[in-house]
C-alpha cells in the first residue's frame, strides 16, 4: 500500500507478491462519506496501471482481475472522478512479480593463504526480481557449524571470516548455500572439501636472482613461500617476448637453478605455489622480477666491407665499414671495435680501437699486400676477427656481373638483378651488392650499404636505407678468391620529373662553337635518377620551335659543346633534366651571340 489512505483502500488478493504468470484481484473501495458530495451514486472509480486507465465503475467500490503482469513492480492507482472536478487519487498499491530462487550452482570455497579466511562463491541462476537472501552454512568436524547471511541483492560471494588450520589437513568440511525470497527457497548441493583442497597459497614473494661469478650459466632464482608449500612452477621469458618457458619443481625450498638463459637479456620471472601434488589449487603468479643477465663474450663475426679510393701515384685511401652484431651475437654492450691493418709481406701491423662508429678510414701506400681484421669487444671479450685481404674489387673484367638492372619493387625497395660473369660462373664465391646515395661530387662521407648474396643467386632486394625520389649508385661485385669484378648501375625506388632544370652558369666560345657549363640540380630536386639533360636554343624574338640536343646523364659531366649556332645571331638557351618519369621545368635562360666568322 502507498500508506494509510484517508479516502479509501486498494487491496490485492491473493498477495501483493506473486509468481510470474499469476492472476491478481484488485479492489478499490471508498471509505464512508468520501465519495462525491451530494451525488454518491455518481462516484466514478477509475483504476490506473501506472498512467494507463484499465477499469472504471460507478459506485463505492471497484473490482478488477489483472493478468499478464511483467517481472518487477507495477503500481496501481485508484482515482475518483466527480462531475465538474479533477480526478482525485484515492489510494494505490504495488504488485511485485518475480520467481522463486533457482538452486545455486557450482558452489566452491577457497582460503587464500594459510592465514586467510574461508570464502565461497556460487552461481545464483536467473534474476528473481525480488529481494533474495542468501545464507551460507559451513559444517566441520566435532559438529562445528558456521553461518553467514548476505543482504546484497546480487549475492554470489560470502566470506565466513574463519581460518582453517592444517592441524588435521584431511578433515572434511561441508558448505551449502540457501536462497530465500517471498516466493520460495532453494539450496545448493553440498560441497565437501578438506583443508588441502581449499587453501590456495599466497603467491611467492621476495624473489631474487643471483649469478655466480657474473656468469649466465650459473644462475639461481631465490624466493620465499608459505610453510606448507610442496610444489612450485616457474615461468620466465625475455622481456620482449610473449612466450613463457615453464619449469615445475618439487620441494624446491625457495631456490632453483636456471641453465638456459641467454646472456645480456632482460628477463621477467614469476613463480606460483601449491600445497599438494594433486589436491588444491595453484597460487596466483607472484609479482614479476625483472633482471638482466650478465654479458658473455661476443659470438659470430662482423660483416665487413671496404672501399678503395686512389689519391695519387703512391697513396690510396681505404674506408672500412662493418655492420653491428645482432643482439644475440653481441651478448653485451659493444664497447669498441678493434681494427688491425697489416702489410702481409713486411709484417707491419697497426691496431686501433674504434668507439661510436662502424667505419674507419686510413691512407696506405699503393704498393704491398694489405689485410685488415676487425672484431667487436664487450666487457667479457672479443668476437672472432673478420679478416679481409684488400684487393682491387673491380680489377678482373671477366668476373664482372653482366646485364645488371635495378627496378623499383614497391615502396622503398629496389630489385637488383644480374647475370653471372662470362668467366667460369662456378668460380664466383659470393656476390656483394653495394648501394649509396648518388652525390655528384662523389662524396666519400655518404653512408655505404651492402648485402652479401650466395653465388647461385642472380638477384637481391635492397630495402635498407632506401628513400623515395633518391638516386642510388648500385654496384654488384663478384668475388673469387683474391679477385673481384664489378658492374654498376643507377636505380631508384620511386621517381618523378625533376623539380627544376640545370642552371647554366657560363657559355664560352671556342673555335666557332660554344661550350655550355651548368650547375648540377640539387639532389633533393632531382626526384630520382637522371637519364638525360636537354639543351634547348632558339633565335631571340623568334616564334619558331627551339632546337634541342639530348645528352646522356653522367655524374661528373657539367659541360657540353654545341657547334650548330650561326655567328652574329643572338640565341636564347636553357636546359632541362629528365628522369624515367618525365622532364623538368626550364632552368634559367641565357642569351648568347657567337662572334666567329660565318662559314
Amino acid at each position: 500500500k502507498i500508506d494509510a489512505c484517508k479516502r479509501g483502500d486498494v487491496t490485492v488478493k491473493p498477495s501483493h507478491v506473486i509468481l510470474l504468470g499469476s492472476t491478481v484481484n484488485i479492489t478499490c473501495s471508498l471509505k464512508p462519506r468520501q465519495g462525491c458530495f451530494h451525488y454518491s451514486r455518481r462516484n466514478k472509480l477509475i483504476l490506473y496501471k501506472f498512467d494507463r486507465r484499465i477499469n472504471f465503475h460507478h459506485g463505492h467500490s471497484l473490482n478488477s482481475q489483472v493478468t499478464g503482469l511483467p517481472l518487477g513492480t507495477t503500481l496501481f492507482v485508484c482515482k475518483l472522478a466527480c462531475i465538474n472536478s479533477d480526478e482525485i487519487q484515492i489510494c494505490g498499491a504495488e504488485i511485485f512479480v518475480g520467481v522463486a530462487p533457482e538452486q545455486p550452482q557450482n558452489l566452491s570455497c577457497i582460503q587464500k593463504g594459510e592465514q586467510g579466511t574461508v570464502a565461497c562463491t556460487w552461481e545464483r541462476g536467473r534474476d528473481t526480481h525480488l529481494y533474495t537472501e542468501y545464507t551460507l552454512q559451513l559444517s566441520g568436524p566435532k559438529n562445528l557449524t558456521w553461518q553467514k547471511q548476505c543482504k546484497d541483492i546480487y549475492c554470489d560471494y560470502l566470506d565466513f571470516g574463519i581460518n582453517l588450520t592444517p592441524e588435521s589437513p584431511e578433515s572434511n568440511f561441508t558448505a551449502k548455500v540457501t536462497a530465500v525470497n517471498s516466493l520460495g527457497s532453494s539450496s545448493s548441493l553440498p560441497s565437501t572439501f578438506t583443508f588441502l583442497d581449499i587453501v590456495r597459497p599466497l603467491p611467492p614473494w621476495d624473489i631474487r636472482i643471483k649469478f655466480q661469478k657474473a656468469s649466465v650459466s650459473r644462475c639461481t632464482l631465490y624466493w620465499r613461500d608459505e610453510g606448507l608449500v610442496l610444489l612450485n612452477r616457474l615461468r620466465y621469458r625475455p622481456s620482449n617476448s610473449r612466450l613463457w618457458n615453464m619449469v615445475n619443481v618439487t620441494k624446491a625450498k625457495g631456490r632453483h637453478d636456471l641453465l638456459d638463459l641467454k646472456p645480456f637479456t632482460e628477463y621477467e620471472f614469476q613463480i606460483s605455489s601449491k600445497l599438494h601434488l594433486y589436491k588444491g589449487s595453484w597460487s596466483d603468479w607472484s609479482e614479476s622480477l625483472r633482471a638482466q643477465t650478465p654479458e658473455e663474450e661476443p659470438t659470430g663475426m662482423l660483416d665487413v666491407w671496404y672501399m678503395k679510393r686512389h689519391i695519387d701515384y703512391s697513396r690510396q685511401q681505404i674506408s672500412l665499414f662493418w655492420k653491428n652484431l645482432s643482439v644475440s651475437e653481441a651478448r653485451g654492450k659493444i664497447l669498441h671495435y678493434q681494427v688491425t691493418l697489416q702489410e702481409l709481406t713486411g709484417g707491419k701491423a697497426m691496431t686501433q680501437n674504434i668507439t661510436g662508429h662502424t667505419s674507419w678510414t686510413t691512407v696506405i701506400p699503393r704498393t704491398g699486400n694489405w689485410a685488415v681484421a676487425v672484431s667487436a669487444a664487450n666487457s667479457k671479450g672479443s668476437s672472432l676477427p673478420t679478416r679481409i685481404n684488400i684487393m682491387n674489387l673491380c680489377e678482373a673484367g671477366l668476373l664482372a656481373p653482366r646485364q645488371v638492372s635495378a627496378n623499383s619493387e614497391g615502396m622503398d625497395n629496389i630489385l637488383v638483378t644480374w647475370q653471372p660473369p662470362r668467366k667460369d660462373p662456378s668460380a664466383v664465391q659470393e656476390y656483394v651488392v653495394e648501394w649509396r646515395e648518388l652525390h655528384p661530387g662523389g662524396d666519400t662521407q655518404v653512408p655505404l650499404n651492402w648485402l652479401r648474396s650466395r653465388p647461385y643467386n642472380v638477384s637481391a632486394l635492397i630495402s635498407e636505407n632506401i628513400k623515395s625520389y633518391i638516386c642510388y649508385e648500385i654496384r654488384v661485385y663478384a668475388l673469387s678468391g683474391d679477385q673481384g669484378g664489378c658492374s654498376s648501375i643507377l636505380g631508384n625506388s620511386k621517381h618523378k620529373a625533376p623539380l627544376s632544370g640545370p642552371h647554366i652558369n657560363a657559355i664560352t666560345e671556342e673555335k666557332g662553337s660554344i661550350l655550355i657549363s651548368w650547375n648540377s640540380i640539387p639532389v633533393q630536386e632531382q626526384m630520382g635518377c637522371l637519364l638525360h639533360y636537354r639543351i634547348y636554343w632558339k633565335e631571340r624574338d623568334s616564334n619558331s620551335q627551339p632546337q634541342l640536343c639530348e645528352i646522356p646523364y653522367r655524374v661528373s659531366q657539367n659541360s657540353h659543346p654545341i657547334n650548330s649556332l650561326q655567328p652574329r645571331v643572338t640565341y636564347v638557351l636553357w636546359m632541362t633534366a629528365l628522369t624515367a618519369a618525365g622532364e623538368s621545368s626550364h632552368g634559367n635562360e641565357r642569351e648568347f651571340c657567337l662572334q666567329g666568322k660565318a662559314n
Partner: nanobody
Framework: QVQLQESGGGLVQPGGSLRLSCTAS????????MDWYRQAPGNEREWVAS???????YYDGSAKGRFTISRDNAKMTVYLQMNSLKPEDTAVYYC?????????WGQGTQVTVSS
C-alpha cells in the same frame, strides 16, 4: 535498511524549473521502482511519477509533459526535472522505494511556486 534523502527543492516563480534528486543508501534499490509523490497543504499524499528498475518512466496526468523522471543506478539516485511549474505544484515532494517488505520514504523537500 534503505535510507532516502531528497534535495533540490526551493522557491521558484511560475513557469520556472527545478530539479529534485533523491539518493538511496543500500544497493537493493536497483531492482525496484523509484517513485516521486507530493503532498500539498491540507491534501493527501499523491503519486507523481515512477521509474522502473529498467528505466521505463510513468507519470500521473498532472505531471505528464512537464516533468521528467530519470535514474542513475550507479549513483543510486532518482531525479525529477520539473519544468513549466505552476502554483498548484506547490507541495512537499517525497521520494519512495516500494519493496515487498515495505515502503521506504524520504523526509521530503519543499517546492514553492509563487510570484
Amino acid at each position: 535498511q534503505v535510507q532516502l534523502q531528497e534535495s533540490g527543492g526551493g522557491l521558484v516563480q511560475p513557469g520556472g524549473s527545478l530539479r529534485l534528486s533523491c539518493t538511496a543508501s543500500g544497493s537493493i534499490v536497483s531492482i525496484y521502482n523509484m517513485d516521486w509523490y507530493r503532498q500539498a497543504p491540507g491534501n493527501e499524499r499523491e503519486w507523481v511519477a515512477s521509474i522502473t528498475s529498467s528505466g521505463d518512466p510513468y507519470y500521473d496526468g498532472s505531471a505528464k509533459g512537464r516533468f521528467t523522471i530519470s535514474r542513475d543506478n550507479a549513483k543510486m539516485t532518482v531525479y525529477l526535472q520539473m519544468n513549466s511549474l505552476k502554483p498548484e505544484d506547490t507541495a512537499v515532494y517525497y521520494c519512495k522505494v516500494p519493496t515487498e517488505k515495505g515502503n521506504y520514504w524520504g523526509q521530503g523537500t519543499q517546492v514553492t511556486v509563487s510570484s
